[in-house]
Amino acid sequence: YDFTNCDFEKIKAAYLSTISKDLITYMSGTKSTEFNNTVSCSNRPHCLTEIQSLTFNPTAGCASLAKEMFAMKTKAALAIWCPGYSETQINATQAMKKRRKRKVTTNKCLEQVSQLQGLWRRFNRPLLKQQ
């Protein structure tokens, strides 16, 4: 999916009002010094591409994020504010239902969510312009 035509300001507002708080809840008890951000993004469409990938694609050691509250709210925000996003996700959702697993918060998942917070932070940053 090409995130270029999303309403970035509306997604940002949704993130600040709810998604960010769910991410904080998920990470509660984790030290703020524990993880360095290693996943980066260069602009808002790229950030959303990386956010979608980390949130919804299972990875080695962390297969369960898609059913978390922050993930469901992320999906809702993208569906509302990114034209045509819902249609691209129908097949992916059906595949996900088939491999639903018990929720387990592993250290790998905590690290992945920390990376997500970093990607969202880059997405939210003001436009940094060289004067």
């Epitope: 300001e9 940002k12 969202w120 932070r121 003001p126 940094l128």
Partner: antibody, heavy 119, light 107 residues
Framework: QVQLVQSGAEVKKPGASVKVSCKAS????????IEWVRQAPGQGLEWMGI????????YYAQKFQGRVTLTADKSTSTAYMELSSLRSEDSAVYYC????????????WGQGTTLTVSS | DIQMTQSPSSLSASVGDRVTITCRAS??????LVWYQQKPGKAPQLLVY???NLQSGVPSRFSGSGSGTQFSLTISSLQPEDFATYYC?????????FGTGTKLEIK
Amino acid sequence: QVQLVQSGAEVKKPGASVKVSCKASGYAFTNYLIEWVRQAPGQGLEWMGIINPESGDTYYAQKFQGRVTLTADKSTSTAYMELSSLRSEDSAVYYCAKESLTGSSYDYWGQGTTLTVSS
Amino acid sequence: DIQMTQSPSSLSASVGDRVTITCRASENIYSNLVWYQQKPGKAPQLLVYGARNLQSGVPSRFSGSGSGTQFSLTISSLQPEDFATYYCQHFYETPLTFGTGTKLEIK
């Protein structure tokens, strides 16, 4: 807990330079931008610039372009603000501040460093 | 550069009063606005981000609203510790300019 500790007060002569430090602790230093703001006596807050400690990328207010240099030392988790060609109008309290978790504000601030420029 | 204009520049009020401070941006900044409180000799403290989100630990008597170019900070019932100077700052693009400040004084 998150802390930003700045260097002590400075007295400088016009034309000189000053370098203020801001030592960060309690968080992953390279994950967050650092902003610098100043406040002249009895005046409002004035935004000076931002540094990304990870990349070293800097963004300055037009007013300070060419006179201010922001740097960061990852090994000591310390940010620096150097201001050159000082004049009396640069007398102010200088603050560093850390970007918030969400990237939409600056949530932790240093205690401030007072600079006095006088002949 | 985006200019931020606060009003009033100073305001006298009593404990228990409801007060509203406004901030106007010279162009559309959507919801990219923060509010700070500053007391004499201290660094600013974050109150509100994203125009309407209350920073953790900030009392619920503070609230922010607005979007686009018009924003406000409301204190529903003034407490003695609320007498301070308040600044808005836009967070849309660099330079991240501040408002001119509103000094809230005891009547």
